[in-house]
Interface confidence: low
C-alpha cells in the first residue's frame, strides 16, 4: 500500500495510490468506499471515473493514466470509520533529460563491492511491454528486456545516473515510467568500532508468568556478529527464544542490527541473572546486560537504571 503521506511524482507518468486497509475492504464488500480530492480551490470533491478520463478506481487503488500537474493536492480514502490521507505533489518533467533530477534515488557503493541494479515494477508488471536501462541517458545493451539487471563488483567507471524506463500500454496508449538511481562509487571505507546502543546495564521490570522482549541494537560493520549469552549453557532454557536478527544499511554503508531475546512465562530462575548481548568484530567487543527484576522490587533500584 502507499503508506508515505507525502508523495512527489513526475507529470506524464502512470501513478497509483493504494490504501492500507485493502484486505479489510475485501471482507466488507458492501461497505461504501470513497475517494476524495481537495486542492486550493475545491474542498473534498469525490472522485469517480466521470471526474476525469485519466482516473480509474479499483477496490484498493486510485490510478492516474497519467498523472498531470493539476492533480497536485490532497487525496483521501474513506471507508466506514477508516480514513487515509496523502499529499500529492506533481512536478514538471525535465524535457531535456531522460530523468527528472528531483526524482532520483542516490546510492553509495564501495569500489570492488557487489553492485546491483534491477529494473522491476511489481504493480505494473503485467502491463509492461519492455524495459530499458539507461546510463547517463544512454541505453545499455542488456540481454533481458523484461527486467534488465546489472550485477557486478563495482568499479569507479560504474559511477553515473542509471534510469530504468518501463514501457507499457493502457487503453491503446503508450506510457512510460522512469526510476533513476544516482550511483556514486567511493573508496573502501574503514571499519567502525561496533557499538551497542543504549545503557550498558538495564533493569527490566517484569511479572512472573508474563513474557518480555529484550531488544539489543548495535551499529556495526557487515561482517560483525551480534549474539546473546545467558545462563551456564546457552539455549538450554526452552522458554528463551532468539528472534531473527534485523539489519538495515545506514546511508554511510554501515549496518544497524537489532536482535530480540524473547523470554516467555517468566519464572523465578529468570530473575536477577545477567542476559548479555555482545557485538564482536576485529575492532573489539561491546557488551550490554539486562537483568529482570520483579515489579514489586522496583523501588529498590534508582530510576536512571530502569527500562520498561
Amino acid at each position: 500500500c502507499t503508506s508515505r503521506p507525502h508523495i512527489t511524482v513526475v507529470e506524464g507518468e502512470p501513478f497509483y495510490l493504494k490504501h492500507c486497509s485493502c484486505s479489510l475492504a475485501h471482507e466488507i464488500e458492501t461497505t461504501t468506499k470513497s475517494w476524495y480530492k481537495s486542492s486550493g480551490s475545491q474542498e473534498h470533491v469525490e472522485l469517480n471515473p466521470r471526474s476525469s478520463s485519466r482516473i480509474a478506481l479499483h477496490d484498493c487503488v486510485l490510478e492516474f493514466w497519467p498523472v498531470e500537474l493539476n492533480d497536485t493536492g490532497s487525496y483521501f480514502f474513506q471507508m466506514k470509520n477508516y480514513t487515509q490521507k496523502w499529499k500529492l505533489n506533481v512536478i514538471r518533467r525535465n524535457k531535456h533529460s531522460c530523468f527528472t533530477e528531483r526524482q532520483v534515488t542516490s546510492k553509495i557503493v564501495e569500489v570492488k563491492k557487489f553492485f546491483q541494479i534491477t529494473c522491476e515494477n511489481s504493480y505494473y508488471q503485467t502491463l509492461v511491454n519492455s524495459t530499458s536501462l539507461y546510463k547517463n541517458c544512454k541505453k545499455l545493451l542488456l540481454e533481458n528486456n523484461k527486467n534488465p539487471t546489472i550485477k557486478k563488483n563495482a568499479e569507479f567507471e560504474d559511477q553515473g545516473y542509471y534510469s530504468c524506463v518501463h514501457f507499457l500500454h493502457h487503453n491503446g496508449k503508450l506510457f512510460n515510467i522512469t526510476k533513476t538511481f544516482n550511483i556514486t562509487i567511493v573508496e573502501d571505507r574503514s571499519n567502525i568500532v561496533p557499538v551497542l546502543l543504549g545503557p550498558k546495564l538495564n533493569h527490566v521490570a517484569v511479572e512472573l508468568g508474563k513474557n518480555v522482549r529484550l531488544n539489543c541494537s548495535a551499529l556495526l560493520n557487515e561482517e560483525d556478529v551480534i549474539y546473546w549469552m545467558f545462563g551456564e549453557e546457552n539455549g538450554s532454557d526452552p522458554n528463551i527464544h532468539e528472534e531473527k536478527e534485523m539489519r538495515i544499511m545506514t546511508p554511510e554503508g554501515k549496518w544497524h542490527a537489532s536482535k530480540v531475546l524473547r523470554i516467555e512465562n517468566i519464572g523465578e530462575s529468570n530473575l536477577n541473572v545477567l542476559y548479555n548481548c555482545t557485538v564482536a568484530s576485529t575492532g573489539g567487543t561491546d557488551t550490554k546486560s539486562f537483568i529482570l527484576v520483579r515489579k514489586a522490587d522496583m523501588a529498590d533500584i534508582p530510576g536512571h537504571v530502569f527500562t520498561r
Epitope: 560493520n221 561482517e223 556478529v225 551480534i226 546457552n234 539455549g235 536478527e245 564482536a280
Partner: antibody, heavy 118, light 107 residues
C-alpha cells in the same frame, strides 16, 4: 585469496583425543565467527561447534557438548577443535567454515578426515 | 530437539524447474540457507538469509521461507546442478543445524 586449510586429522582409538587446526588466510580472521561442520561417510552435514570473532561466545551441538572444545588464536589466524573421549560415531570429514554477520557460511575448507577405530 | 526434514531425492529433466523443500517447526521465523555439495567436494553456499544469492551463483537458484517450509528452486535445471543439497537453519545465535540432504538427479 580467501582460504581455510584444515589439518590434524588421523586415526585414533575410541576414548582418545585429537586436536584439529584450521589456518585462515586472505581475510581479517578476527572479524568473523567460525564454525566446525562434519560429515560422516555417506551421510549428511552435521554442525559441530561455532565461536564468535573475539572467542567470547562458544556454541556446541548436543552430540559433542562436554567432549569437544572450540577455540581460536586471532594472532595466529587459526581456529582449533580439541576433541576428547572420541567415539566411533565421531568418524567423519571435519570442515571449518567462516560465518558472516548476515548468516552467510560462505567459505569452507577442504576438510580433514578423522577416523575413530580400534 | 529441533529437526529439519528434506526429501531424500528429487528428480528433474534438463531445462525443467526443481523444487527442494525443507520443513521444520516455525522455520519461517529462522533464517534458512542452502548448500550444494558435489561428490568429493566441500559444500558451496547457494542461498542465504532465506532468499539472497551470493555473487557467482547463477540466477536460476532462488529461495523462499515462510511458515514451516523453506524451498530451494532451480529453474532451467542443468546437468551441472546434479548434486546433494542441504538446508540449514540458524536456531540460536551462532548455533545452527542442517537438514538430512536431498540428492538432485538431472535425468
Amino acid at each position: 585469496e580467501v582460504q581455510l586449510l584444515e589439518s590434524g586429522g588421523g586415526l585414533v582409538q575410541p576414548g582418545g583425543s585429537l586436536r584439529l587446526s584450521c589456518a585462515a588466510s586472505g581475510f581479517t580472521f578476527s572479524s568473523y565467527a567460525m564454525s566446525w561442520v562434519r560429515q560422516a561417510p555417506g551421510k549428511g552435514l552435521e554442525w559441530v561447534s561455532a565461536i564468535s570473532g573475539s572467542g567470547g561466545g562458544t556454541y556446541y551441538a548436543d552430540s559433542v557438548k562436554g567432549r569437544f572444545t572450540i577455540s581460536r588464536d586471532n594472532s595466529k589466524n587459526t581456529l582449533y577443535l580439541q576433541m576428547n573421549s572420541l567415539r566411533a560415531e565421531d568418524t567423519a570429514v571435519y570442515y571449518c567454515a567462516r560465518i558472516r554477520g548476515d548468516y552467510r557460511t560462505d567459505i569452507w575448507g577442504q576438510g580433514t578426515t578423522v577416523t575413530v577405530s580400534s | 530437539s529441533y529437526e529439519l526434514t528434506q526429501p531424500p531425492s528429487v528428480s528433474v529433466s534438463p531445462g525443467q524447474t526443481a523444487s527442494i523443500t525443507c520443513s521444520g517447526d516455525k522455520l519461517g521465523d529462522k533464517y534458512a540457507s542452502w548448500y550444494q555439495q558435489k561428490p568429493g567436494q566441500s559444500p558451496v553456499l547457494v542461498i542465504y538469509q532465506d532468499s539472497n544469492r551470493p555473487s557467482g551463483i547463477p540466477e536460476r537458484f532462488s529461495g523462499s521461507n515462510s511458515g514451516n517450509t523453506a524451498t530451494l528452486t532451480i529453474s532451467g535445471t542443468q546437468a551441472m546442478d546434479e548434486a546433494d543439497y542441504y538446508c540449514q537453519a540458524w536456531t540460536h545465535s551462532l548455533s545452527t543445524l542442517f537438514g538430512g540432504g536431498t540428492k538432485l538427479t538431472v535425468l
